[in-house]
């Protein structure tokens, strides 16, 4: 889980070690702050859970790509 020690900086200290189905994911944000120990991606799921993930992992990159495309596609 992400941890906000001194808001508004949120950091990830551990990454999920399991893939989460891309269909469970609603959005993401990148964590690149120098105040954090590592770069990370925080996914928000459709039921509003926040999960820290490793941006180097392929499933994380695929999920971000999928969410980017979903955002770009206008809803009919």
């Amino acid at each position: 889980q992400p941890d906000a020690i001194n808001a508004p900086v949120t950091c990830c200290y551990n990454f999920t070690n399991r893939k989460i189905s891309v269909q469970r994911l609603a959005s993401y944000r990148r964590i690149t702050s120098s105040k954090c120990p590592k770069e990370a991606v925080i996914f928000k799921t459709i039921v509003a859970k926040e999960i820290c993930a490793d941006p180097k992992q392929k499933w994380v990159q695929d999920s971000m790509d999928h969410l980017d495309k979903q955002t770009q596609t206008p809803k009919t």
Epitope: K19, S21, R24, I46
Partner: antibody, heavy 119, light 113 residues
Framework: QVQLVQSGAEVKKPGASVKVSCKVS????????MHWVRQAPGKGLEWMGG????????IYAQKFQGRVTMTEDTSSDTAYMELSSLRSEDTAVYYC????????????WGQGTLVTVSS | DIVMTQSPDSLAVSLGERATINCKSS????????????LTWYQQKPGQPPKLLIF???IRESGVPDRISGSGSGTDLTLTISSLQAEDAAVYYC?????????FGQGTKVEIK
């Protein structure tokens, strides 16, 4: 293509435990979320529990809490479901079910394992 | 927990006629951001595991005949068999995968009249 092959039928006495296995092929178990569903004779489908990567842990239906344990042996890509303190109402077919990364719904099912609880 | 309620519990339909099964969820299974309803329909025949027919409430699984369709969103979902064939005699279940615990409807048995 994911394939799920379950262990064979079991006959158990009331109060005993049963452990059903589900062997995954065509995929790595840790890339899946394995769930277990049971069906008593002539009854509907009942979700028992499964691995929830959103919580990073296995979650169980309240009805089975404390009596069921779901585990994984990642070295053999095999999932297990153990149910203890068996009673006659636990007589059912037990299914493992899972989904791929791109789906989220149960698109793969094991063939089912019949567990009969009888004295 | 989201409760799924199917109606009717059973129905007998003549060959070539329409069969309609309703599934009502106690809360919406629609995620508005992607406009998807997290609902599947399964068909089950005796001695077999459930077979996936429909996902996202209306998308047919590969190989499923087009006489079988899913519709609706949110809390009111429907499975329709437009022209019943002998091989359609089975029990049909809806299931939500929006939030855990994943829950099934009680099932609807479709018989040939």
């Amino acid at each position: 293509q994911v394939q799920l092959v379950q262990s064979g039928a079991e006959v158990k006495k009331p109060g005993a435990s049963v452990k059903v296995s589900c062997k995954v092929s065509g995929y790595t178990l840790t890339d899946l979320s394995m769930h277990w569903v049971r069906q008593a004779p002539g009854k509907g489908l009942e979700w028992m529990g499964g691995f929830d990567p959103e919580d990073g842990e296995t979650i169980y239906a309240q009805k089975f809490q404390g009596r069921v344990t779901m585990t994984e042996d990642t070295s053999s890509d095999t999932a297990y479901m153990e149910l203890s303190s068996l009673r006659s109402e636990d007589t059912a077919v037990y299914y493992c079910a899972t989904h791929e990364f791109w789906s989220g719904y149960f698109d793969y099912w094991g063939q089912g394992t019949l567990v009969t609880v009888s004295s | 927990d989201i409760v799924m309620t199917q109606s009717p519990d059973s129905l007998a339909v003549s060959l070539g006629e329409r069969a309609t099964i309703n599934c009502k969820s106690s809360q919406s299974v629609l995620f508005s951001s992607n406009n998807k309803s997290y609902l599947t329909w399964y068909q089950q025949k005796p001695g077999q595991p459930p077979k996936l027919l429909i996902f996202w409430a209306s998308i047919r699984e590969s190989g499923v005949p087009d006489r079988i369709s899913g519709s609706g969103s949110g809390t009111d979902l429907t499975l329709t068999i437009s022209s019943l064939q002998a091989e359609d005699a089975a029990v049909y279940y809806c299931q939500q995968y929006y939030s855990s615990p994943w829950t099934f409807g009680q099932g609807t048995k479709v018989e040939i009249k």
